[in-house]
């Protein structure tokens, strides 16, 4: 709606951002799909969850994800401008006690079972993008977004604000 916000370039950036409250400001149960309307699905395999990006058959039920919204301070940059703005961060949980995590070493997105308080790897800055899409930026690795690669979710580095419109980091949220 506002257009694309751009890529965070501060070196300390989101690492230093603080979640204002321990409890979420609101929660939202939604299905997650790609810009090209492929569904994000979750399957239990060998006692662990796998994440897939796939075309669903007609009338096939979409998996739902619980988005928990948190208000967060956006830190001043290293030049010390002294201004802390506000951001919206989310955690994503497709099933009880499991959350999407950013594995920055492997550039992968994984489902981990964990207890609260959740680690920083489970938090993503939610970006309000054009064309009724959103994107998810890693709290632990600014400029790195959840994206689609080879029919899986992966972490994708976005090196300039012009590249934020890249379709593979755009997602749609729907109640249906």
């Amino acid at each position: 709606a506002f257009g694309i916000s751009g890529v965070q370039k501060y070196t300390r950036a989101l690492h230093d951002s603080s979640i204002t409250g321990i409890s979420p400001i609101t929660e939202y149960l939604a299905s997650l799909s790609t810009y090209n309307d492929q569904s994000i699905t979750f399957a239990l395999e060998d006692e662990s969850y796998e994440i897939y990006v796939e075309d669903l058959k007609k009338d096939e039920k979409k998996d739902k994800v619980l988005l928990s919204y948190y208000e967060s301070q956006h830190p001043s940059n290293e030049s010390g401008d002294g201004v802390d703005g506000k951001m919206l961060m989310v955690t994503l949980s497709p099933t009880k006690d499991f959350w999407l995590h950013a594995n920055n070493k492997e550039h992968s997105v994984e489902l981990h079972k964990c207890e609260k308080p959740l680690p920083d790897q489970a938090f993503f800055v939610l970006h309000n993008m054009h064309s009724n899409c959103v994107s998810f930026e890693c709290k632990t690795d600014p400029g790195v977004f959840i994206g689609v690669k080879d029919n899986h979710l992966a972490l994708i580095k976005v090196d300039s604000s012009e590249n934020l419109c890249t379709e593979n980091i755009l997602f749609k949220l729907s109640e249906t």
């Epitope: 916000s5 751009g6 919204y69 939610l126």
Partner: antibody
Framework: EVQLVESGGGLVQPGGSLRLSCAAS????????VSWVRQAPGKGLEWVAT????????DYVDSVKGRFTISRDNSKNTLYLQMNSLRAEDTAVYYC????????????WGQGTLVTVSS | EIVLTQSPATLSLSPGERATLSCRAS??????????LNWFQQKPGQPPRLLIF???NRGSGVPARFSGSGSGTDFTLTISSLEPEDFAVYFC?????????FGQGTKVEIK
């Protein structure tokens, strides 16, 4: 300190043109969506136009479409509003405003520059 | 477009009193489970200042006496105990969709 400083306002005749500028400082300009919002004397606020951080997307209120053009130069940390075919009803204080990081609401505002369209 | 209607147009109160301002939208401003309704304060000769975003969350540096509530189409800004510096005009604004629209404003004046 985060700052937005508008300039370029003034008196112009109906049908004339004006170019407003907004100089940004204290933050990574290219990382944020920025907009113009105007306020006619003694009246309410009206959103005019928005441009994305990467210059990819622009949006306008219907009343200025085809007459106004929003643009930005990220290398100069500057936002622009080119206003053509100006009308009396465009008379207002024009504010430059920056969205929050993540692009959900207007977070930072400049002091505004007055545009008067009159013969 | 989404039309926002604020009431009352003017609120005459004394310092220390509670102020309750209303904003009604012509359609829901909910998106992605968020109520995309924001509140701004404006004093004469100054730009607007963000008070509340997403219906109920205070902007940076906003005192705790300001609070927002509501969902869907009906929203309220409450100032629990008016300070002298709170006498100003207050605008609601929706960021759900283009064109972004503002309410016509509520003036809070000293009684």
């Amino acid at each position: 300190e985060v700052q937005l400083v508008e300039s370029g306002g003034g008196l112009v005749q109906p049908g004339g043109s004006l170019r407003l500028s907004c100089a940004a400082s204290g933050f990574t300009f290219s990382s944020f969506s920025v907009s113009w919002v105007r306020q006619a004397p003694g009246k309410g606020l009206e959103w005019v136009a928005t441009i994305s951080g990467g210059k990819t997307f622009t949006d306008y209120v219907d009343s200025v479409k085809g007459r106004f053009t929003i643009s930005r130069d990220n290398s100069k940390n500057t936002l622009y509003l080119q206003m053509n075919s100006l009308r009396a009803e465009d008379t207002a204080v024009y504010y430059c405003t920056r969205a929050n990081y993540g692009n959900w609401f207007f977070e930072v505002w400049g002091q505004g520059t007055l545009v008067t369209v009159s013969s | 477009e989404i039309v926002l209607t604020q009431s009352p147009a003017t609120l005459s109160l004394s310092p220390g009193e509670r102020a309750t301002l209303s904003c009604r939208a012509s359609e829901s401003v909910a998106k992605y489970g968020l109520s995309l309704l924001n509140w701004f304060q404006q004093k004469p000769g100054q730009p607007p200042r963000l008070l509340i975003f997403a219906a109920s969350n205070r902007g940076s540096g906003v005192p705790a006496r300001f609070s927002g509530s509501g969902s869907g189409t009906d929203f309220t800004l409450t100032i629990s105990s008016l300070e002298p510096e709170d006498f100003a005009v207050y605008f609601c604004q929706q960021s759900k969709e283009v064109p972004f629209t503002f309410g016509q404003g509520t003036k809070v004046e000293i009684k």
